[in-house]
C-alpha cells in the first residue's frame, strides 16, 4: 500500500520516524552510537552521517559517554544535567554504557576464526559473532574495542573514519548464520587493497574473495538485564538468532528440506514448504537438498549461482525478478535497477544518475508492468527475495547520500550484488 504523501515517514531498523526527526542509531554490537547522526528526509530515506568533531583547544579533553565529541573540562555541562545511561550486568560483572567486552559460550556453533563481541548500551547487552581476519603475524595483540586479536600496527575495527564519512545502516536486523551473506559491517579504518565497500556482498559468480572474509557478519543477540537469557532458539544443538531460518535436522530423517523453521524471539516456528502443482516444464526433477522439484536447464544458465526450490521460491521465500539497465551518454551514466512485484502488480524502478563518479540524483519510480515492458535496455539479471530487496533499499539510502558528496566508483555495483541469492556453503538455507 502506498504511503500517503502527507504521512511520509522513514523506516529504520523496524522503527518509524517522522520527516525531519533526528536520532543516534543502535548498531549492534556497539549499541547506541553517538558519533552517528541519522535524519529522516522528506522523501522517506534515512540519511546517516558521522559527526564531525571540532578541534578542542585544551591539553586534556574529556570524553562524556552520551556525547560523541571530546570537550574541554571548562565547557562541560553541569553534573545535574548529565544523562545517566543505564549500566548492564552480565555474568556477574557490571559494564558501563558504551563498554565493549568479550563473552564466551553464547554461540554453540562458533567457528574457530570467530569471537563473541558484546557491548553494553542503555542497559541492554548486545552480542554478536564477529569473524576475525586471518593473522599474518606470530604474536597478535588484544585491542580494547574488538574481541579479535590483531597484528601490531594493523587497523582494527573502529569508528574513527575520516571526517564526514557516511556510515551505512546495518540493514538487516534479522541475523542469519550464512555468515558472509548480505550484511554490512562497519568498514575497517584502513581498507586492504581490493576490499569491497560492502564486505558481505557476493560477486556475480557467487565466489567469495578471501579479502572479503576478513570482515565478518555480526549476528545480533540481545540479552535483557532482567531475564539473563538470549533471544535465541536452540535446535538440534545449534543456536539460531531471532529471525533466522533453517531446515530442521531430525534424527530419523536427517535434514527435512520440506520444513522451514524460523526463530521468533526464543520460540521456533516451523512450517511446511508447499510445492507448486504445476511446473513450467514437462519433467521437473528432484534434487538433493531441495524440497520441491525444479525445472532443469535454462534457468540455472541464465542466473548463475542461484538455486530456487521452483520457479519462484528460494529457501521458502518467494522471489521476484530484478532487471537492470545501464545507459551512458556525455560522461553521464544512468543506471536503473527494477524489481517486478505481484502484490501490488507493478515495477519499482530505482534510477541513479552519476556523472564523473558523483551521484547527480537518485529516485524511485513505480510503473505498471505493461509500461515497463515498453522501456528499452532492461535485461533480467537475477531473482531476489523481499528481504534482500529491503537490505538493498536500505543500503541504497545510505550510498545515495554518501555518493552525492564524494566520488563513488563501485558502491552501487557492490550493493546490487546483495540481490543475488546464493546457496550457503553446505547447500542448505
Amino acid at each position: 500500500e502506498q504511503v500517503k504523501h502527507s504521512e511520509t515517514y522513514c523506516m529504520f531498523q523496524d522503527k518509524k520516524y517522522r520527516v525531519g526527526e533526528r536520532w543516534h542509531p543502535y548498531l549492534e554490537p556497539y549499541g547506541l552510537v553517538y558519533c552517528v547522526n541519522c535524519i529522516c528526509s522528506e522523501n522517506g530515506n534515512v540519511l546517516c552521517s558521522r559527526v564531525r568533531c571540532p578541534n578542542v583547544h585544551c591539553l586534556s579533553p574529556v570524553h562524556i559517554p552520551h556525547l560523541c565529541c571530546p570537550r574541554c573540562p571548562d565547557s562541560l555541562p553541569p553534573v545535574n544535567n548529565k544523562v545517566t545511561s543505564k549500566s548492564c550486568e552480565y555474568n556477574g560483572t557490571t559494564y558501563q554504557h558504551g563498554e565493549l567486552f568479550v563473552a564466551e559460550g553464547l554461540f554453540q556453533n562458533r567457528q574457530p576464526n570467530q569471537c563473541t563481541q558484546c557491548s553494553c548500551s542503555e542497559g541492554n547487552v548486545y552480542c554478536g559473532l564477529k569473524t576475525c581476519p586471518k593473522l599474518t603475524c606470530a604474536f597478535p595483540v588484544s585491542v580494547p574495542d574488538s574481541c579479535c586479536r590483531v597484528c601490531r600496527g594493523d587497523g582494527e575495527l573502529s569508528w574513527e573514519h575520516s571526517d564526514g564519512d557516511i556510515f551505512r545502516q546495518p540493514a538487516n536486523r534479522e541475523a542469519r548464520h550464512s555468515y558472509h551473506r548480505s550484511h554490512y559491517d562497519p568498514p575497517p579504518s584502513r581498507q586492504a587493497g581490493g576490499l569491497s565497500r560492502f564486505p558481505g556482498a557476493r560477486s556475480h559468480r557467487g565466489a567469495l574473495m578471501d579479502s572479503q572474509q576478513a570482515s565478518g557478519t555480526i549476528v545480533q543477540i540481545v540479552i535483557n538485564n532482567k531475564h539473563k537469557h538470549g533471544q535465541v532458539c536452540v535446535s538440534n544443538g545449534k543456536t539460531y538468532s531471532h529471525g533466522e531460518s533453517w531446515h530442521p535436522n531430525l534424527r530419523a530423517f536427517g535434514i527435512v528440506e520440506c520444513v522451514l523453521c524460523t526463530c521468533n524471539v526464543t520460540k521456533q516456528e516451523c512450517k511446511k514448504i508447499h510445492c507448486p502443482n504445476r511446473y513450467p516444464c514437462k519433467y521437473p526433477q528432484k534434487i538433493d537438498g531441495k524440497c520441491c522439484k525444479v525445472c532443469p536447464g535454462k534457468k540455472a544458465k541464465e542466473l548463475p549461482g542461484q538455486s530456487f526450490d521452483n520457479k519462484g521460491y528460494f529457501c521458502g521465500e518467494e522471489t521476484m525478478p530484478v532487471y537492470e539497465s545501464v545507459f551512458m551518454e556525455d560522461g553521464e551514466t544512468t543506471r536503473k535497477i527494477a524489481l517486478e512485484t505481484e502484490r501490488p502488480p507493478q515495477v519499482e524502478v530505482h534510477v541513479w544518475t552519476i556523472r564523473k563518479g558523483i551521484l547527480q540524483h537518485f529516485h524511485i519510480e513505480k510503473i505498471s508492468k505493461r509500461m515497463f515492458e515498453e522501456l528499452p535496455h532492461f535485461k533480467l539479471v537475477t531473482r531476489t527475495t523481499l528481504s534482500q530487496w529491503k537490505i538493498f533499499t536500505e543500503g541504497e539510502a545510505q550510498i545515495s547520500q554518501m555518493c552525492s558528496s564524494r566520488v563513488c566508483r563501485t558502491e552501487l555495483e557492490d550493493l546490487v550484488k546483495v540481490l543475488y541469492l546464493e546457496r550457503s556453503e553446505k547447500g542448505h538455507c
Partner: antibody
Framework: QVQLQQPGAELLRPGSSVKLSCKAS????????MHWVKQRPIQGLEWIGN????????HYNQKFKDKATLTVDKSSSTAYMQLSSLTSEDSAVYYC??????????????WGQGTSVTVSS | NIVMTQSPKSMSMSVGERVTLSCKAS??????VSWYQQKPEQSPKLLIY???NRYTGVPDRFTGSGSATDFTLTISSVQAEDLADYHC?????????FGAGTKLEVK
C-alpha cells in the same frame, strides 16, 4: 521550489514549425520524465509523449508521432517540443509536466503554465 | 489505446454537498490512475495518484478509490473553491490517456 517555465503564446502561420520550450528549475532535471500534454478549448487533455532527460529516451502517442519531436538540453535544464507542418488543428494550449513527488511515473505533479499556440493565416 | 470515460460531463452542487465523480477504464489498469483538478485559466493540478493516494497539500475532503476499471473521486463536502474541471488519467500503459473531464459547478 520546483518550477516549469513556458512562454505564454505563439502566433504562427499554417505549414510553419515551432519549437516550444520548458525550462525546469528547483530539482535535478535529468531525474524525472518530462511529459507534454495538449489541451484544445472545451476539450480534455491529450498526452503527446514524454522524454527521459537523462538519456533522451522518448515515448510518443502514435497520433503525434509525425507532428511532435521531443528533445532536451541538459546544460540549460530545458525540454523542447517541436511541432511541424502546423494546421488549425494544432491550435491549443501545450503544457509540459513532470512528476516529482508522486513516485508514479505517469502522475504529473508539476505543470508549466502552458503555451497557447494559435495557427492562423 | 486505453479509453478513460468520465461521468457525468458536468454537475452543479451546493456548498457542503457530497460529490462523486466516476471514471471507467476500457481495460484493467490496476491502480495506475490519477485525478487532476483544473480551475478556469489555470494548469491542471494533481489531486490523487495511484488511485487512492492524496497528493501533498490536497485537502482531505478529496478521496480517490477504485481499482482495475472503475475509479471514483469523492469530495466529501464541496467548497466554492472546488469549482473546476476534473480529469482522470491512466499511466498503466503508453500512451497515457485522460478522460474528457467532468465540469463541477458550485451553486
Amino acid at each position: 521550489q520546483v518550477q516549469l517555465q513556458q512562454p505564454g503564446a505563439e502566433l504562427l502561420r499554417p505549414g510553419s514549425s515551432v519549437k516550444l520550450s520548458c525550462k525546469a528549475s528547483g530539482y535535478t532535471f535529468t531525474t524525472y520524465w518530462m511529459h507534454w500534454v495538449k489541451q484544445r478549448p472545451i476539450q480534455g487533455l491529450e498526452w503527446i509523449g514524454n522524454i527521459d532527460p537523462s538519456d533522451s529516451e522518448t515515448h510518443y502517442n502514435q497520433k503525434f508521432k509525425d507532428k511532435a519531436t521531443l528533445t532536451v538540453d541538459k546544460s540549460s535544464s530545458t525540454a523542447y517540443m517541436q511541432l511541424s507542418s502546423l494546421t488549425s488543428e494544432d491550435s491549443a494550449v501545450y503544457y509540459c509536466a513532470s512528476y516529482y513527488g508522486s513516485s508514479y511515473v505517469g502522475s504529473m505533479d508539476y505543470w508549466g503554465q502552458g503555451t497557447s499556440v494559435t495557427v492562423s493565416s | 489505446n486505453i479509453v478513460m470515460t468520465q461521468s457525468p460531463k458536468s454537475m452543479s452542487m451546493s456548498v457542503g454537498e457530497r460529490v462523486t465523480l466516476s471514471c471507467k477504464a476500457s481495460e484493467n489498469v490496476g491502480t495506475f490512475v490519477s485525478w487532476y483538478q483544473q480551475k478556469p485559466e489555470q494548469s491542471p493540478k494533481l489531486l490523487i495518484y495511484g488511485a487512492s493516494n492524496r497528493y501533498t497539500g490536497v485537502p482531505d475532503r478529496f478521496t480517490g478509490s477504485g481499482s482495475a476499471t472503475d475509479f471514483t473521486l469523492t469530495i466529501s463536502s464541496v467548497q466554492a473553491e472546488d469549482l473546476a474541471d476534473y480529469h482522470c488519467g491512466q499511466s498503466y500503459s503508453f500512451p497515457l490517456t485522460f478522460g474528457a473531464g467532468t465540469k463541477l459547478e458550485v451553486k
